[in-house]
Structure formats: C-alpha cells, structure tokens
Interface confidence: low
C-alpha cells in the first residue's frame, strides 16, 4: 500500500526530501509549502502551522514558487529609446527592449541596461550587414557598379541602371543618369518604393558572371577599378 | 570555382548534439560570411545562423539557446553545433555563402547533409 | 519575426501561360529576394532586391513589389520553370523564409 500521503507542515523522513513546491524550514525542521509565483511569505511555517501566503504589493513581483518575505522590486520604467514589452505584474518583471533604429548594447539578464541607435551609412556606403537586437550595422563602400544616395541604416548598394547611352555616368553614391530615351531593362522594373529603378549594372562596367558551380548559381559581380578609398564604414 | 561541402553523422539519438562542417573552396571565409539553413522532409527552408566574414554572428533567436557556429578560416572550414536535438530536428542541413557585395543573398550552396535524429 | 505568407502554396501552369506568386511579410520590408528549388536539389538564388535576376535566371522571370506585398511572374511558363519557389527577406532578424509556393506543369 502507499505510504500516507503527509499535509504540510510534515517531518521528512530522514535523509528525504521535501515535495514539488515545498521546501525544508530549518527552523521548524519541517517540510512546509511555497507560495506561489505573484505572493509571498508573510508568515513562515511553524511545528504545527503552514506558511502563510500574501500577494506582492503593487511594482513588485515573484516569478517563481518561494518562500521569500519580501517580493522582488521591478525594475524601473523604460527609458526614451526603449519600448516595454513585458509589464510589471505581480508574477513578472517588467522588460524593456530597444525600440526600432536602436539595438541593444549592453544586455542584462532579461532585456537591455543600454540602448544604442543603429548606424546610419551614408552616401557612397550600404548596409553590409543588418543591425540586429543586439548588434550594429556594419557599412562598407558601394563596389563598381553599385551605389546608395541615402544616409540610412538599412539601404544596400544598388546596381546602377543600364542606359543606350550614358549622360552621366554612376559613381558609389550617384546612379547613372540616362539621355532623354528611356533606359534599356534587361530585367525586371524596380520595386516601387526606390527612388531609381533597379536593374543591372551601368553599361560602362561590364558585369562578368562569377564560375557557376551545380548547384549554386551566382550573381553578376562587377569587374574594374575600385572606387577612391572614402573610409570603410560610415555613420 | 566556388563550392561548399557539408559533412555530418547522418543519424543522431535523440537529446544528444549535433556537429556538421562545412568545408569551402574557391573563396576566402575573412571575405565571405557562410549561413546554416535547414529543411526538414517536404518542407520549408528555415533559416538557422550566420557567421560573417570578420568573426561576428547572428542566430535564429528561436534555436540560439541550442546552436553554436564557429570557422576555421585556415582550413576554410565553418563548423555548427547543435544541442538536444529531438527528431523533429531531423532534416537537410545546407551551408551557404553570404554574398558580401551587398545583395544580401546566399549565393552558392553546399549539396546539403541528411541528419535523421532516431533511437 | 518578420513572417512570410506565400500564396498560393500549389500550383499548376499549362506551358505558355502566365503565372503570379505572391509573397506577403507580417511587417514591411526593404526589399525581397526568391530563391527557386526542385526537388533533390539545393536552392538556387534567383531574384535579388525585390526585382533583378541573378545570372542564368531566363528572362520571362519578373519581380515586383514593396512594404508588405512583393510577386513573382513568369510571363510565359515553361516546363523547366517547375519548382518551389521561397521569398526570403533580410531586413530583420531572423531571416526568414516563406513556406514556399510550390509550381507544378500542367
């Protein structure tokens, strides 16, 4: 038959441990229950009495089961370049998180101590990698045959559009620009939202497909000079 | 000429980890990053992580607890590792180059290495 | 997570017709890429911001699109053109992919 089921408080068997969501009062030597995650320990077990539970006054919490007699304190309201994406509750602490353009440079155990904003990459540069939560942008200079006209975080170097014939040619933060005949489009129209129509690179660099290897497939990369060293990232 | 290979264990037990190397040719990895991607049996791509050209990473922060990337770029080799793996980790495993002139996309693949997680 | 809707996610094309998958992000994003699978292979890249074919792609193949809402055409389908095809973007991590649109000839 199974032993007796015990009530708390109740003496361990020796060299036994408590139950789930209990725990041993060393004062009482008696295994005794935790309060659940939101309360706390008002009152701790005795001999003949269980612990007595209380809920967490207001901006202060417990997240697991315990038996602490004060809840923790929450943390303190979320600066200007955070957003708070968890609150305060009485069985969680509040998180903040930066808000978008920002990322986080110095974490803590749960959201961000320190918020900084994204870089910004300005003309002439693109976004070489994309910031994310908890990293910057990375810029690097427009290669031949690309360009970005925009101080952003998060535009690319673009292929300058193809002409019949070139009125001013591309550089790392100009597009080319066309005579007054519409410009040739070996590809697609760009998408709506760009200032220029992407296509493929200028007429004066010839692009040069990379060896194609099964079963990847390459983009064109652009050959010819490298443009004038203008610093490796921007801000 | 650009190519990736993957190289795994094929089968897995389940709650053990995972380690699969990608060894490049044809391309520096101090110029190109490399991406994991996964795809499980008749489905989708699932983007895992990333290792870029200069050391720096960025995890899929649904699996970061479980996956770690890391390269050897003497020997032109990136390396994942993936813990507790259970059997809906089961599926290809790709390596890829990063296209680092800008167009943010993955420009040769590896073939691809079957990883079945089974007791 | 930026998550990416395809639709639809089958499909069939009689050769000579003209088809349209779409591709749609839960947040907007700066621009769109598509890479096209068959089966037992590798993915392939095949349309990078938003609308230009990586090299080797036939030019029948077109993308457009912005924000939220990005397409993938073929102006007149062809037999080789049976594949998956995924959208994927990079503007926030994770990177994710769409669930794909799977195009089958008829």
């Known amino acids: 038959l199974p032993a007796q089921v015990a009530f708390t408080p109740y003496a361990p068997e020796p060299g036994g441990t408590c139950r789930l969501r209990e725990y041993y009062d060393q004062t009482a030597q008696m295994c005794c229950s935790k309060c659940p995650p939101g309360q706390h320990a008002k009152v701790f077990c005795t001999k003949t009495s269980d612990t007595v539970c209380d809920s967490c006054e207001d901006s202060t919490y417990t997240q697991l089961w315990n038996w602490v007699p004060e809840c923790l304190s929450c943390g303190s309201r979320c600066s200007s370049d955070q957003v708070e994406t968890q609150a305060c509750t009485r069985e969680q602490n509040r998180i903040c998180t930066c808000r978008p353009g920002w990322y986080c440079a110095l974490s803590k155990q749960e959201g961000c101590r320190l918020c900084a904003q994204l870089r910004k990459c300005r003309p002439g540069f693109g976004v070489a990698r994309p910031g994310t939560e908890t990293s910057d942008v990375v810029c690097k200079p427009c290669a031949p045959g690309t360009f970005s006209n925009t101080t952003s975080s998060t535009d690319i170097c673009r292929p300058h559009q193809i002409c019949h014939v070139v009125a001013i040619p591309g550089n790392a933060s100009m597009d080319a620009v066309c005579t007054s005949t519409s410009p040739t489009r070996s590809m697609a129209p760009g998408a709506v939202h760009l200032p220029q129509p992407v296509s493929t690179r200028s007429q004066h660099t010839q692009p040069t497909p990379a060896p194609s290897t099964a079963p990847g497939t390459s983009f064109l990369l652009p050959v010819g000079p490298s443009p004038p060293a203008e610093g490796s990232t921007g801000d | 000429e650009v190519q990736l290979q993957e190289s795994g264990p094929g089968l897995v037990a389940p709650s053990q980890s995972l380690s699969i190397t990608c060894t490049v040719s044809g391309f520096s990895l101090t110029s190109y990053g490399v991406h994991w991607v996964r795809q499980p049996p008749g489905k989708g791509l699932e983007w895992l992580v990333v290792?870029?050209?200069?050391?720096?990473?960025t995890y899929n922060s649904a699996l970061k607890s479980r996956l770690s990337i890391s390269k050897d770029n003497s020997k032109s080799q990136v390396f994942l590792k993936m813990n507790s793996l259970q059997t809906d980790d089961t599926a290809m495993y790709y390596c890829a180059r990063h296209d680092d002139d800008g167009y943010y996309a993955m420009d040769y693949w590896g073939q691809g290495t079957t990883v079945t997680v089974s007791s | 997570d930026i998550v990416l809707t395809q639709s639809p996610s089958l499909m069939s094309a009689s050769p000579g017709e003209k088809v349209t998958m779409t591709c749609s992000a839960s947040s907007s994003v700066g621009y769109m890429y598509w890479y096209q699978q068959k089966p037992r292979s590798s993915p392939k890249p095949w349309i990078y911001?938003?609308?230009n074919l990586a090299s080797g792609v036939p030019a029948r193949f077109s993308g457009s699109g912005s924000g939220t809402s990005y397409s993938l055409t073929i102006s007149s389908m062809e037999v080789e053109d049976a594949a998956t095809y995924y959208c994927q973007q990079w503007s926030s991590d994770p990177f994710t992919f769409g669930s794909g649109t799977k195009l089958e000839i008829k």
């Open positions: 290792i870029w050209s200069d050391g720096g990473t």
């Open positions: 911001l938003t609308s």
